[in-house]
């Protein structure tokens, strides 16, 4: 595989939004009181100096933590189980592809700095996710809360890959 | 830059139907939920309902429940008010505003300039 | 429905002032609480959010707290241009209900 985070990981991480929307269960009108801050570092998916390792190691972290939250029996009890398959699924192949990607960006020499702290940032992001599931004893409404928050986070995540994917496309046509 | 514009001003009969809209711009229109607020002459906010325009799943205000239909179609953006059979006492100005749903984000950020509605024999 | 009750209904104050809005809710709505603006023939602008965020681009003149079922608005020293009608609206449960408006008049 090349590592030009082609078209079809663009693809699988749209078709993972569209998972998770659809894996709703109750109607989120019912959770307005639930609603939690679990701050998204947003900085880390806004910045114009986007760098090849930073942005494919936020979406390895990003994929990473997203496959360990749904991948639990807590996760198995809350979900239909045939969208959770395809999600694994859909998820264990961007996170083989972005593995692959990684290995070949570190062998190029790009410092271990801007992979490492990503991924630091995004699991304490994660673990704050984790202890409000548990304060609210995993309810239909925290999961449907987390689900929001999951969707928008990956969402601002394929943005920045999106815009690294353009502004390689500028300076392959200048 | 977001943007809510909504439809022109309306002068409707009693008895008459009206649908009005509210189109997004500028942000992803499914990521919002679209809420609608009423205002009668002289008088304060009231909040009629909400609509996900990502599924049209939608919630209403006891008040205004069977009294109006609020819809959406995401392929243009656009979220709709709408009456069977207008009353005088629909005459108001009407309000959309999204709201960020679950997600930590402020309420109502953004209003749509409002849209009057006339209701008279 | 959670009600909610704000005072007073109307006030009138000059330039400079330090002006105090408050609104009770019928019931716990935790932080939950927003503070709009309005001025005539205007949409509504978001002032506050979560009863005590400044939304982006509102002057920091304007300050909200409270929590639970106590909240208050404060504009520390009152411009020309705030003089308009104030809401309060809650957004822990549906029905999203708001206030009954307090009219920020010039002395």
């Known amino acids: 595989l090349g590592c030009d985070l082609p078209q079809n990981h663009g693809l699988l991480s749209r078709n993972t939004l569209v998972l998770l929307h659809q894996m709703r269960r109750i109607s989120p009108f019912l959770c307005l009181k639930d609603r939690r801050d679990f701050r998204f570092p947003q900085e880390m998916v806004k910045g114009s100096q986007l760098q090849k390792a930073h942005v494919m190691s936020v979406l390895h972290e990003m994929l990473q933590q997203i496959f360990s939250l749904f991948h639990t029996e807590r996760s198995s009890a809350a979900w239909n189980m045939t969208l959770l398959d395809q999600l694994h699924t859909g998820l264990h192949q961007q996170l083989q592809h972005l593995e692959t990607c990684l290995l070949q960006v570190v062998g190029e020499g790009e410092s271990a700095g801007a992979i490492s702290s990503p991924a630091l940032t995004l699991r304490r992001y994660f673990q704050g996710i984790r202890v409000y599931l548990k304060e609210k004893k995993y309810s239909d409404c925290a999961w449907e809360v987390v689900r929001m928050e999951i969707m928008k986070s990956l969402f601002l995540s394929t943005n920045m890959q999106e815009r690294l994917r353009s502004k390689d496309r500028d300076l392959g046509s200048s | 830059e977001v943007q809510l514009v909504q439809s022109g001003a309306e002068v409707k009969k009693p008895g008459e139907s009206l649908k009005i809209s509210c189109k997004g711009s500028?942000?992803?229109?499914?990521?919002?939920?679209i809420g609608w607020v009423r205002q009668m002459p002289g008088k304060g906010l009231e909040w009629m309902g909400i609509?996900?325009?990502?599924?049209?799943?939608?919630a209403y205000s006891p008040s205004f429940q069977g009294q109006v239909t609020i819809s959406a179609d995401k392929s243009i953006s656009t979220a709709y008010l709408q009456w069977s059979s207008l009353k005088a006492s629909d005459t108001a100005m009407y309000y959309c505003?999204?709201?960020?749903?679950?997600?930590?984000?402020?309420?109502?950020?953004?209003w749509g300039q409002g849209t009057l509605v006339t209701v008279s024999s | 429905d959670i009600q909610m009750t704000q005072s007073p209904s109307s006030l009138s104050a000059s330039v400079g002032d330090r002006v105090t809005i408050t609104c009770r809710a019928s019931?716990?709505?935790?932080?939950?609480l927003n503070w709009y603006q309005q001025k005539p023939g205007k949409a509504p602008k978001l002032l506050i959010y979560?009863?005590?965020s400044l939304q982006s681009g509102v002057p920091s003149r304007f300050s909200g707290s409270g929590s639970g079922t106590d909240f208050t608005l404060t504009i520390s020293s009152l411009q020309p241009e705030d003089f308009a009608t104030y809401y309060c609206?809650?957004?822990?449960?549906?029905?999203?209900?708001f206030g009954q408006g307090t009219k920020v008049e010039i002395k």
């Open positions: 505003a999204r709201h960020p749903g679950l997600n930590w984000a402020p309420d109502f950020d953004y």
């Open positions: 500028g942000y992803s229109f499914t990521s919002y939920w």
């Open positions: 609509i996900d325009p990502s599924d049209s799943d939608t």
């Open positions: 019931q716990s709505i935790s932080k939950f």
């Open positions: 979560f009863a005590s």
């Open positions: 609206q809650q957004s822990y449960d549906f029905p999203i209900t």
